[in-house]
């Protein structure tokens, strides 16, 4: 058993039929010695008396808020949560496996630049009685500070009969060094509590591996005289690291016909303009990627040819 | 050329060669995003690799103030990786494919290090750790880790030379 926060404790249980469970001793936080009784949750049934209560925790029915009282007055509370271990593996019931980029991916994180700011998100089908707490650091043995905000519900989607809820959190490395080559990964730890179930999820990454620039901005077309060609121009996104002579991007320009089956023409360039042939009803799209490190491409910025 | 007295390197040549190094490092190990090599107990194998750290002066301001600190650090790293790529980690079993970019990568590391420090001038170089994995699968894993680490190193080097070419060239 360990303390998650004040008056909240996590009991780690091997979860299998007829498992013996864990013996837990609760102590009433009071100077009183006599006349103390214990109850669980809303029930008025007295579970025991005395300053300590010994219980055998085997299942969710044994978890919950234990309260010690004296003469009708509440003295203190202890909330017991369960962390299930089945076949040697901690349960992952609360979050959905996003399966990208690989199985057992519960947390996904992205950064728009090298400033040390990043966003992580996760999915669940659970709508109520759910809390998240996020901690992060650079490295684990001698951790350097990363500050995370509160996790918030960022999207709701309907998936068949069920809804899916997306939560996200923003974190910022306290002493980020955008130009350095990272040697220690960022660690992100999410504590999830649904009713009386506790689970924890972790992710470890280098900022360079989760970079995904915003799409190029101010995408414009300039027709060239007496030609089907156009000059496409764009700018670096505002959120990208500066100076651009140091933090450079490379770009992919695509001409796409109306039908998805039509052949796509693609041009790669380090410049912020390109000359392409604009077909009728086609659209021109541009996306960006770090020039020197192959992390994710940005989403496309698009304009119609006409 | 970057001479240990402080003259400027051939920024544009260094820029071109370092960008080529980035391309080669990724073509040598393209599936890097799909393998989480940090799960494989990376500390003991790649902790000794020279990293370009915060105090090494490789940020835009540091380059403007005195690019020599940074260039020396890059040079150390280039020599380190050049030696690793020439070691039995890469020459031993399992053999690299004949068209593997590792050979080109090795040559380009050497080429860039020579651009930074011509014959007859010596900066301190870092000791290469003795990494001689006994099993072929260990060697394969170590190659992946070294290439992954190299990708990060050459990305920073390429940024340095791109910025130098744009802002510090005579």
């Amino acid at each position: 058993i360990w303390e998650l926060k004040k008056d909240v404790y996590v009991v780690e249980l091997d979860w299998y039929p007829d498992a013996p469970g864990e013996m837990v001793v609760l102590t009433c936080d009071t100077p009183e010695e006599d006349g103390i009784t214990w109850t669980l949750d809303q029930s008025s049934e007295v579970l025991g008396s005395g300053k300590t209560l010994t219980i055998q925790v085997k299942e969710f029915g044994d978890a919950g808020q234990y309260t010690c009282h004296k003469g009708g007055e509440v003295l203190s509370h202890s909330l017991l949560l369960l962390h299930k271990k089945e076949d040697g593996i901690w349960s992952t019931d609360i979050l959905k496996d996003q399966k990208e980029p690989k199985n057992k991916t519960f947390l996904r994180c992205e950064a728009k630049n090298y400033s040390g700011r990043f966003t992580c998100w996760w999915l669940t089908t659970i709508s109520t009685d759910l809390t998240f707490s996020v901690k992060s650091s650079r490295g684990s043995s001698d951790p350097q500070g990363v500050t995370c905000g509160a996790a918030t519900l960022s999207a709701e989607r309907v998936r068949g009969d069920n809804k899916e809820y997306e939560y996200s959190v923003e974190c910022q490395e306290d002493s980020a060094c955008p130009a350095a080559e990272e040697s220690l990964p960022i660690e992100v730890m999410v504590d999830a509590v649904h009713k009386l179930k506790y689970e924890n999820y972790t992710s470890s990454f280098f900022i360079r591996d989760i970079i995904k620039p915003d799409p190029p901005k101010n995408l414009q077309l300039k027709p060239l005289k007496n030609s089907r060609q156009v000059e496409v121009s764009w700018e670096y996104p505002d959120t990208w690291s500066t100076p651009h002579s140091y933090f450079s991007l490379t770009f992919c320009v695509q001409v796409q016909g109306k039908s998805k089956r039509e052949k796509k023409d693609r041009v790669f360039t380090d410049k912020t303009s390109a000359t392409v042939i604009c077909r009728k009803n086609a659209s021109i799209s541009v996306r960006a990627q770090d020039r020197y490190y192959s992390s994710s491409w940005s989403e496309w910025a698009s304009v119609p040819c006409s | 050329r970057a001479v240990p007295g402080g003259s400027s390197p051939a920024w544009t040549q260094c820029q071109q060669l370092s960008q080529k190094l980035c391309t080669l490092a990724w073509s040598a190990h393209p599936l890097v995003g799909h393998m989480d090599l940090r799960e494989e107990g990376d500390e003991e194998t790649t902790n000794d690799v020279p990293h370009i750290q915060c105090g090494d002066g490789c940020d835009p301001q540091g380059l403007r103030d005195n690019s020599q600190f940074c260039l020396q650090r890059i040079h150390q790293g280039l020599i380190f990786y050049e030696k690793l790529l020439g070691s039995d980690i890469f020459t031993g079993e399992p053999s690299l494919l004949p068209d593997s970019p590792v050979g080109q990568l090795h040559a380009s590391l050497l080429g860039l290090s020579q651009l930074l420090q011509p014959e007859g001038h010596h900066w301190e170089t870092q000791q290469i750790p003795s990494l001689s994995p006994s099993q072929p699968w260990q060697r394969l894993l170590l190659r992946f880790k070294i290439l992954r680490s190299l990708q990060a190193f050459v990305a920073v080097a390429a940024r340095v030379f791109a910025h130098g070419a744009a802002t510090l060239s005579p």
Epitope: D41, Q42, E59, F60, G61, D93, T124, T125, I126, S127, T128, D129, N162, K163, Y165, H194, K195, L196, K197 | -
Partner: antibody
Framework: QSVEESGGRLVTPGTPLTLTCTVS????????MIWVRQAPGEGLEWIGI?????SAYYASWVNGRFTISKTSTTVDLKMTSPTTGDTATYFC??????????????WGPGTLVTVSS | FELTQTPSSVEAAVGGTVTIKCQAS??????LAWYQQKPGQPPKLLIY???KLATGVPSRFSGSGSGTQFTLTISDLECADAATYYC???????????FGGGTKVVVV
């Protein structure tokens, strides 16, 4: 502590109807409330709940046909466009106060809604 | 999400024992309640958290199970136990909520 439903009557299909659940002896700001219906001779079917904080959650079949809201002492169930299939006794019940998705220990007697042309 | 109750009806003698099963289509941990309903009356809470007896409910009623399989057992049957019994999941309003189809208990 009690709850009581009212507003059930005979309506024609498509005529909006609001049922009201009036509570006494406890505060709605501390408990989840549920609306459940039971067609003649059938089982219990949950429609939706409204949390202590005022968030409403609905069964997947509801699709906007019902809306739950509350004041300090009442919980309303609005039937936007009733059909004959909505003929049932409608129950309101109070949760235990432990969770938003809760079990229910205080029930009203129910109010009968008949939808017929 | 579905809760399947079996059997749909059962007949037993006074003093006998009745077992009603409730199966969830996904794990709901121990978040299951049992209710008793008599004709013309609202449901009455018997058991919550799969096995905890509600206030004032005789100990002849007991609940067990967790995950997806749950059981309500009524022992020493009395005539007053003739009613329809419902299980209810309260795991989550989106990912596991609702009532079973009911089991009618006839006491002979």
């Amino acid at each position: 502590q009690s709850v009581e439903e009212s507003g059930g009557r005979l309506v024609t299909p498509g005529t909006p109807l609001t049922l009201t659940c009036t509570v006494s002896g406890f505060s709605l700001s501390s408990y989840t409330m549920i609306w459940v219906r039971q067609a003649p001779g059938e089982g219990l079917e949950w429609i939706g709940i409204i949390s202590a904080g005022g968030s409403a959650y609905y069964a997947s079949w509801v699709n906007g046909r019902f809306t739950i809201s509350k004041t300090s002492t009442t919980v309303d169930l609005k039937m936007t466009s009733p059909t004959t299939g909505d003929t049932a006794t409608y129950f309101c019940a109070r949760g235990s106060g432990t969770y938003t998705s809760d079990y229910f220990n205080i029930w009203g007697p129910g109010t009968l809604v008949t939808v017929s042309s | 999400f579905e809760l399947t109750q079996t059997p749909s009806s059962v007949e037993a003698a006074v003093g006998g024992t009745v077992t009603i099963k409730c199966q969830a289509s996904q794990s709901i941990d121990s978040w299951l309640a049992w209710y008793q309903q008599k004709p013309g009356q609202p449901p009455k809470l018997l058991i919550y958290s799969a096995s905890k007896l509600a206030t004032g409910v005789p100990s002849r009623f007991s609940g067990s199970g967790s995950g997806t399989q749950f059981t309500l057992t009524i022992s020493d049957l009395e005539c007053a136990d003739a009613a329809t019994y419902y299980c209810q999941s309260y795991y989550d309003a989106n990912a596991g909520y609702g009532f079973g189809g009911g089991t009618k208990v006839v006491v002979v």
